[in-house]
């Protein structure tokens, strides 16, 4: 078995880091491989083991439980196949952040001619990401996802108002949201579960 390239690792910056790696042939990840990891520069850190699972026939993924990270945390990692080391490297959770995807995306009808989208930030108020995330909302036609609008939410509150008539009347639309950290290096979260609604409004007489 050979590892193709470097494993890709991300932290959710609260409890879990995830590493994924590609192999040159099909493997049973949980029986053939294991990932050892240990907090570096800390005298009493224990050696921990993650048993990977298959995300595809030649792809393994490991979800590692970690303490809430601090900026200086760095983990030594070693990937083993029985008694043979396939890879070793290090990983800094605060330097590779992929936040938890938002949830509970909800559409509210507003008193004016606007829709209000709200969602939940899954981070507690004592976590850095509680006040560091920016959001991206994608709204697309259900029957043609290539026709979409993107809103960048550049404030702390997990909400977005937009005019009903910016979208076509009599059409089903789908919305989803994702987030990313600003002050930490990393990537966008996965998209939230999407919601779908029927966009209907009365056209002005002149447009009917």
């Amino acid at each position: 078995i050979k590892v193709l390239g470097e494993p890709t690792c991300f932290s959710d910056y609260i409890r879990t880091s995830t590493c994924e790696w590609f192999l040159d042939s099909a493997v049973d990840c949980s029986s053939q491989l294991c990932l050892h990891y240990r907090l570096m520069f800390f005298e009493f850190s224990e050696n921990l083991t993650c048993i990977p699972r298959n995300s595809a026939s030649t792809v393994c993924v490991c979800h590692m439980e970690m303490n809430r990270p601090v900026q200086s945390d760095r983990y030594q990692m070693e990937l083993w196949a029985e008694h043979r080391q396939l890879w070793q490297g290090s990983f800094s959770p605060s330097g590779n952040v992929k936040p938890l995807a938002p949830d509970n995306l909800t559409l509210h009808t507003n008193v004016s001619d606007e829709w209000l989208l709200t969602w939940n930030n899954l981070y507690p108020s004592n976590n850095l990401l509680y006040k560091d995330l920016i959001s991206m909302v994608n709204i697309s036609r259900e029957d043609n996802p290539a026709e979409f609008i993107v809103y960048n939410v550049t404030y702390k509150e997990p909400r977005l108002s937009f005019p009903i008539n910016i979208l076509m009347s009599g059409v089903y639309y789908t919305a989803r949201v994702r987030v990313r950290s600003q002050i930490l290096t990393g990537t966008w979260s996965e998209w939230s579960p999407s919601i779908t609604w029927y966009n209907h409004f009365q056209l002005p007489l002149i447009q009917r």
Epitope: V70, Q71, S94, N126, L128, K131, D132, I134, T154, Y155, K156, Q182, I183, L184, T185
Partner: antibody, heavy 120, light 106 residues
Framework: EVQLVESGGGLVQPGGSLRLSCAAS????????MSWVRQAPGKGLEWVSI????????HYAESMKGRFTISRDNAKNTLYLQMNTLKSGDTAVYYC?????????????WGQGTQVTVSS | NFMLTQPSAVSVSLGQTARITCQGG??????ASWYQQKPGQAPVQVIY???NSPSGIPERFSGSSSGDTATLTISGAQAEDEADYYC?????????FGGGTTLTVL
């Protein structure tokens, strides 16, 4: 009205230390990242450091890593910059700046600055 | 790693349009901020997010970006616009400033 008032500047010998403070008012201090920016005499603006809203994450310009430490006390609405092993090249006006919530938007408010002179 | 490059000086006649460029950033990926600084004063933000103006900034100030260049445009420059102007970007672990441009209004 947002106000940022720097203090703690002065004359210090090379190799010495100084601690700058920035008292903030007029906004919810612990909602925002904060930064220090400096300007040497007759020169342009130079970014020094940034600190996250809760003090957990800090970043520094390369030339200041290991010598400067940014910190904050959210209970006192105050930002700090501890400067050690000062060199003549650190002589500058030091500004405290409030970040927009969106960091890519830069600074919406600046203090008036405090002069730091490193000279024997 | 990249550097932001600005012309050291730009001149404009009173009432004419001044353009100050900032080169070297990937402005498809980075937003530019622009600051005005008058002698002996703290900087003031005149543009954020490449093209947005803070409240209180005259409408003659506008910003745009394309490719590796961000541009600050002052349409109908006034005598009080004479100042130093700096561009700035955030790149996920810190800020970078351009070297600054001195605008002279003739």
């Amino acid at each position: 009205e947002v106000q940022l008032v720097e203090s703690g500047g002065g004359l210090v010998q090379p190799g010495g230390s100084l601690r700058l403070s920035c008292a903030a008012s007029g906004f919810t201090f612990d909602d925002y990242a904060m930064s220090w920016v400096r300007q040497a005499p007759g020169k342009g603006l130079e970014w020094v450091s940034i600190i996250s809203w809760n003090g957990e994450i800090t970043h520094y310009a390369e030339s200041m890593k290991g010598r400067f430490t940014i910190s904050r006390d959210n209970a006192k609405n105050t930002l700090y910059l501890q400067m050690n092993t000062l060199k003549s090249g650190d002589t500058a006006v030091y500004y405290c700046a409030k970040n927009h919530y969106t960091l890519t938007w830069g600074y919406d408010y600046w203090g008036q600055g405090t002069q730091v002179t490193v000279s024997s | 790693n990249f550097m932001l490059t600005q012309p050291s000086a730009v001149s404009v006649s009173l009432g004419q349009t001044a353009r100050i460029t900032c080169q070297g950033g990937n402005f498809g990926r980075y937003y530019a901020s622009w600051y005005q600084q008058k002698p002996g004063q703290a900087p003031v933000q005149v543009i954020y997010g490449s093209s947005n103006s803070p409240s209180g900034i005259p409408e003659r100030f506008s910003g745009s970006s394309s490719g590796d260049t961000a541009t600050l445009t002052i349409s109908g420059a006034q005598a009080e616009d004479e100042a130093d102007y700096y561009c700035q970007v955030w790149d996920s672990s810190g800020y970078k400033f351009g070297g600054g441009t001195t605008l002279t209004v003739l």
